[in-house]
């Protein structure tokens, strides 16, 4: 029998802003029951505060609520392990709030196949920002990425569109079945999960010519371009 | 620069008490755990004793549990080791060492340490 | 406790050389392991951290790996200032325990 290992604080996320969630991986448990706790201070404070909600992130988990998020405060925070033999401590995380935000997948995902009889064909994908984000602040930047495929081949195409909640596309594959996702992160944190797929079916007849490939703004209606590939890995790699 | 400077060792007869301190300098004392590490000439490392940031925790090594104490006195930016009951087996080089955080990690800086003999 | 066991205790090699170290935990301590030099009449300096990181202003001739119970500590082309001993230590438990060291001398 031993003290419980060293644990550690391996994540901290937020879907908004508002609240926030940390992890912690436990460390070896010596053998005996083990009991953790998550203490945090504010940059600046020494008042050292326990963990005011271990129930809602699940097991191994911290949540903090409305009440508890602060803006623009880094918080610094340890798990302590506890066994009849003794006590570890993790390594501290410094949190700031701002750059954790992971939001949730956009949401109302449609796509559509547009056929102009003026006009070229195109693929037209339109979704809605997660709810819980509210873009009316200016707190908020989401930008969004979208990645499709032919249902069986195994190479995902991925296209950066920027701060759009739509976007068009027009080098697909005729007669083939498109698996179709988006996902949002915001200007500073991480990508969201992709949304559900959606899938669509590419007519027969959607042909397209090489001189088609690049589409003008005037053609889109001042929509997005399709990105080259200097900017496509640019922006894939955030 | 950081710096740690223990004194306090010399020749001591067995049973009896020592006390070392050692004075930390070119960082801020307060944002870190301390250590002992003493070294038996000729031998390896062997870890005496530590104490996290605000003397919220204190470990002992076995040999000496029951026996040494550590303490801190941060607006001192000292750290100390109360020796009692000393031995022979006690003879050794005393290093204080800097954990590299407030709690639980490897030690990042050591002084140059201090030498304690017990012989009668 | 933990008991840290290093191979060999002693090691003789040349300028130029691979050199590895094998530290061995009696339990699973994760990566919270660090290596450390020592030479003659100094002080230890750490060299790896978190079993493979590399402290800062360490050559990068040293490296780490290892995770659970089996760590080694590598110097890719020996040279003469790395000629020293060389301990492991555990910080998965608060109290720390160190290998027994394993000299490198001149071959």
């Known amino acids: 029998q031993l003290p419980p290992g060293k644990p550690e604080i391996f994540k901290c996320r937020s879907p908004n802003k508002e609240t926030f969630t940390c992890w912690w991986r436990p460390g070896t448990d010596g053998g005996l029951p083990t009991n953790y706790s998550l203490t945090y201070h504010r940059e600046g404070e020494t008042l050292m505060h326990e963990c005011p909600d271990y129930i809602t992130g699940g097991p191994n988990s911290c949540h903090f609520g409305k009440q508890y998020t602060s803006m623009w405060r880094t918080y610094i925070m340890m798990v302590n392990a506890t066994n009849q033999m003794g006590s570890s401590f993790s390594d501290e995380l410094y949190v700031d709030v701002t750059y954790i935000v992971q939001p949730d997948p956009p949401l109302e995902l449609a796509v559509e196949v547009k056929q102009p009889e003026d006009r070229k064909p195109y693929l037209w994908i339109k979704w809605s920002p997660p709810t819980l984000i509210d873009l009316k602040t200016g707190w908020f930047t989401l930008l969004y990425e979208i990645r499709l495929k032919p249902e069986k081949a195994a190479e995902w195409e991925i296209h950066f569109a920027g701060q759009q909640t739509e976007f068009k596309i027009l080098s697909l594959h005729p007669g083939q079945k498109y698996l179709v996702q988006v996902r949002c992160k915001p200007d500073h944190g991480y990508w969201s999960a992709w949304s559900p797929a959606t899938f669509i079916q590419i007519p027969s007849d959607f042909t397209m010519n090489d001189e088609q490939k690049l589409i003008s703004e005037e053609d889109l209606g001042g929509e997005q371009k399709l990105i080259s590939e200097e900017d496509l890995h640019h922006h894939h790699h955030h | 620069e950081v710096q740690l400077v223990e004194s306090g060792g010399g020749l001591v007869q067995p049973g009896r008490s020592l006390r070392l301190s050692c004075a930390a300098s070119?960082?801020?004392?307060?944002?870190?755990?301390m250590h002992w590490v003493r070294q038996a000439p000729g031998k390896g490392l062997e870890w005496v004793s530590g104490?996290?940031?605000?003397?919220?925790?204190?470990g002992y090594g076995d040999s000496v549990k029951g026996r040494f104490t550590i303490s801190r006195d941060n607006a001192k930016k000292s750290l100390y080791l109360q020796m009692n009951s000393l031995r022979a087996e006690d003879t050794a080089l005393y290093y204080c060492?800097?954990?590299?955080?407030?709690?639980?990690?490897?030690?990042?800086?050591w002084g140059q340490g201090t030498l304690v003999t017990v012989s009668s | 406790d933990i008991q840290m066991t290093q191979s060999p205790s002693t090691l003789s090699a040349s300028v130029g050389d691979r050199v590895t170290i094998t530290c061995r935990a009696s339990?699973?301590?994760?990566?919270?392991l660090a290596w450390y030099q020592q030479k003659p009449g100094k002080a230890p300096k750490v060299l790896i951290f978190k079993a493979s990181s590399l402290e800062s202003g360490v050559p990068s001739r040293f490296s780490g790996s290892g995770s659970g119970t089996e760590f080694t500590l590598t110097i890719s082309s020996l040279q003469p200032d790395d000629f020293a001993t060389y301990y492991c230590q555990q910080y998965n438990t608060y109290s720390r325990t160190f290998g027994q060291g394993t000299k490198v001398e001149i071959k």
């Open positions: 070119g960082f801020t004392f307060d944002d870190y755990a």
């Open positions: 060492a800097r954990d590299s955080g407030r709690y639980q990690s490897y030690f990042d800086y």
């Open positions: 104490i996290i940031w605000n003397s919220g925790h204190i």
């Open positions: 339990h699973i301590i994760s990566s919270w």
